[in-house]
Structures are given as C-alpha cells and as structure tokens.
C-alpha cells in the first residue's frame, strides 16, 4: 500500500530473480534471460542498480544475463520518479515477465499491485483562540428581545482553512465541524449563534441542519456588531485597538479569583455539531462565527463567578466515500473568558 | 400543548439491556431538544441524554459508552438504547422536551416516567 502525499517524489521496486534447482528442475543456464516490465504512466524510470541493466522505452528491459547461470541469484533496484499520481489514482500496476530462449514453460507473468492511499494536505488555524467577553446588567426574556444586541456582548471566531492545493472535484467535501458550547447543563442558554459565513471566492453563510442559528430569528446588527447603547459602547471588547480602555471587570480586578469552566467534555454545557462545507477553492477560505453571550442565564446562574471559561471545539475533515483519499483531521480549540462587569456595592448605610 | 408517552422499562439484571421509547404528540415547537432523565429513589432528578431537533447528541458521564439515544423525527419519537446496565442505574426515566434555549425544569414538557430495575 502506498501512503501517497505529494512529498512522495520516488518509488523504489527491488526485484530479486533466481535460477535454483527445484524438485521439478534440475536448474540449467538460462540464454538470453530478460526481465520485462510494463509499468503505468504515472511511473517514470529515474535510475537502476546494477547501472545499465535496464533500457527504457514504453516498456522498461532488464538483461539478466546470457547465460544467467544455473544458482545465480541477482538483485535489481530500479527508481521510478512519481509523475502521474492524482486523486483518481486508485493503484498502480506493473507487470513483470521473465523470458528465455532455454526452455521453461512456466514463466507466467506477475503482476505488481500498489494501493494507493492519497493524503490531502491541508490546515486549520484560528485569527484568536481566546476572546475576552462579559456579563451584567439585569435580565432580559427572550420575548422581550428584539435584535441580537438584546442577547449579550458579541463574539466573533474566525477560522482559517488552507488551500488543499489538489482539487476534490467531486471526490469528497471538506467540511468544518464545530462542537459549539449551545446550552448550559439546565438546558438555558449559553453562546447564542447568530450567523456563520464562509468567505472563499465570495461569501455566503452556512446553515446547518436543525435551525440552531438564531432560532429566534433576532434582528442581526449592522456590520461591525455596532453596540445599541453608549453604555454598551464604553465595554465593547476590540482587539484591533478600538476606543476607550477595556471593560474594568472584577476579574481583572480580583485577578480572577473565582473562576468556573464549561465545557461539554464535563457535562457542564451541552453542545450541538454545527457543520459548514468548505469549498473546493485554490485560496484560503475564512470561516467566520458571530454569537452572543446569553446575559441573562450568567446573571441567573453564574453571578457568584468573577469569570466563566467556556470551550469548544473545532474540527476539519474530510467526508468521502472514496477509501484511498485521506486526510488527517485538524482540530482546534476556541474559548471566552466571560468576566463579570464590576459593580461597586456601597457599604450599608448606618442608622 | 405536548403530551409524551414513554414505555419499555422493566426489570432486568446486570448487564442487559433496555430500548425505551418516548412518543411525543401535540403541537412540537421547532427547533427543540428531547432529553432523558433519571430519578433514583430519595435523590433530585438528574440528566442521562439529550438530542436535538439537528442530530447533535450529549450524555451524562455515567452513561457514555453504554447509552444511545436516537430519534425519529417522522414518528415524533426519541428512543434511549440502555446496554451493560448496572444496579446503579435503577430508577424511574422520565422523557422531556423543550425548545433550545429554555431551562428544563421551567420550561420543559415531561412524560409520567417509567421505571427500570437492574437487579444484581
């Protein structure tokens, strides 16, 4: 079986041809012995050891010798440079045939089958594994919320998918998978996703079975996630450098001295399988998830927690019926920080 | 208003197996979860399984590798595979449905149970 990738550049065929006596043959000399090979296209003659044993044309002949000697043994090693191969390739054959003007009548021809086993090359990479996000305020009810900015702080992932460099044409589909952090283990909400978009040449979203993307059809904001309020602006997180300082939240303040994480390998958060297929495109394709912090259920919930660490997963892979195209799958992580927003609580009043 | 049905517990011995069965009828709410849960005798009621309305799939720690749960969707159905049963997960299974988003014990519709018995 060849683990085919295109780093492969050679292919080594070590032939050993002997002349020994058996209980049907005395072994005589054998004239004019020749070896035969008929090998594909995708196959190119680079060197042979013994050097001049082989000559090559459509079909490759080696000479043994003449007489190859009655117990000779001899050892070819011949080097094909790896042209052809594609994604159609399903193996390689070559076909080898002894022959010799001394008599031997059993010189059937013998057949070399190679699997072959592609490998795509490919990568998944992340602009910002970590986000830094928030809670407080007071609750709101799903009836009550109008547009995505009534949910929470914003969150906004982006994935990178690597050209392949090969095109599937049909052969299969690369698809990234997310294991979103979707419920808390309650069964309220956690990260409340808004819109996926796949930008390759062009952009358009992806929706996943199930309806799971804004399932309360909430009115998307404006590009840019433009924040509803002032009160919201001052705490909206940037990392490209926006205005304003960050939000002063107690964890940074209390340098996090309580901290929980959620995470759906614990039970702790419930996650669904949000799948997006790539396209078959020679660029690099960017994968972008925009979602929200569900407010309410932290303050609920989480209010004794300076901050809440949630997980989730992110895996590229390949679906395809084809059992000699593989791809390792690429797996990553993505997480919130979600800190809570520092309220001063004043002291008592003394009567 | 959902109603749900849940059938084919009973009493079986360590190791076996179970198919329980959950029927849900009345108007059902898309996108949703289906869930099961588990009460043993004296203790709250804790979470086994759930799917949701796209396929995706979760489980407690101590069912995983031992329960599946399935649904189908044009018979209003959610299904719990039980295998390798153990004395410890005797108890009544109650199915439930919510939409996603909302807390189980506010917001979901529950059947009446039906028990299981794991002998040793």
């Known amino acids: 079986r060849l683990q085919y990738s295109r780093d492969v550049r050679k292919l080594l065929l070590s032939i050993n041809v002997t002349n020994t006596r058996t209980s049907e043959r005395s072994g005589e000399d054998a004239h004019e012995a020749l070896l035969t090979l008929v090998v594909p296209p995708a196959l190119l003659l680079s060197s042979v050891r013994p050097p001049g044993a082989c000559q090559a044309n459509e079909t490759i002949f080696c000479e043994l010798g003449n007489p190859f000697k009655r117990n000779q043994r001899m050892e070819l090693l011949i080097a094909f440079e790896v042209i052809g191969v594609t994604l159609h390739t399903r193996d390689l054959q070559v076909q080898l045939q002894l022959s010799t003007s001394s008599h031997q009548d059993n010189l059937w021809p013998m057949i070399l089958t190679l699997l072959v086993d592609y490998t795509l090359q490919t990568s998944l990479s992340m602009v910002n594994h970590r986000l830094q996000s928030f809670f407080g305020g007071t609750v709101m009810g799903e009836s009550g919320m109008k547009t995505v900015e009534d949910v929470g702080s914003p969150l906004k992932y982006e994935f990178q998918v690597g050209p392949m460099g090969e095109g599937l044409v049909g052969l299969g589909t690369l698809v990234l998978g997310l294991e979103w952090p979707y419920e808390v283990s309650n069964g309220k909400w956690l990260l409340y996703p808004t819109e996926i978009t796949v930008h390759g040449n062009g952009s358009w979203p992806c929706r996943p079975p199930g309806d799971l993307i804004n399932p309360l059809n909430l009115t998307l904001s404006d590009p840019g996630d433009r924040p509803s309020s002032p009160q919201r602006r001052r705490r909206q997180l940037d990392p490209g450098g926006g205005q304003g300082p960050p939000p002063v939240t107690l964890a940074a303040a209390k340098k996090a001295k309580s901290e929980t994480v959620l995470t759906c390998a614990t039970g702790r958060a419930h996650c669904v399988w949000l799948e997006c297929p790539i396209p078959d495109a020679p660029v690099v394709t960017n994968v972008t998830v925009k979602a929200r912090v569900w407010n309410s259920t932290f303050i609920e919930d989480y209010r004794d927690f300076d901050r809440v660490r949630v997980n989730g997963w992110a895996t590229l892979f390949l679906r395809t019926s084809i059992p000699t195209i593989n791809m390792e799958n690429k797996t990553t992580w993505f997480s919130v920080d979600i800190d809570s927003e520092l309220v001063e609580e004043l002291p008592a009043e003394i009567e | 208003e959902v109603q749900l049905v849940e059938s084919g517990g009973g009493l079986v011995q360590a190791g076996g197996s179970l198919r329980l069965s959950c029927a849900a009828s009345?108007?059902?709410?898309?996108?949703?979860?289906m869930g099961w849960f588990r009460q043993a005798p004296g203790d709250q009621r804790e979470f086994v399984a759930n799917i949701y309305s796209g396929g995706s799939t979760n489980y407690a720690d101590t069912v995983k590798g031992r329960f599946t749960i399935l649904s189908d969707n044009a018979k209003n159905t959610v299904y719990l595979q039980m295998t390798s049963l153990k004395p410890e997960d005797t108890g009544v299974y109650y199915c439930?449905?919510?939409?996603?988003?909302?807390?189980?014990?506010?917001?979901?519709?529950w059947g009446q149970g039906t028990q299981v018995t794991v002998s040793s």
């Open positions: 009345g108007r059902m709410f898309s996108p949703n979860v």
């Open positions: 439930s449905v919510k939409r996603v988003g909302q807390s189980w014990f506010d917001s979901g519709y």
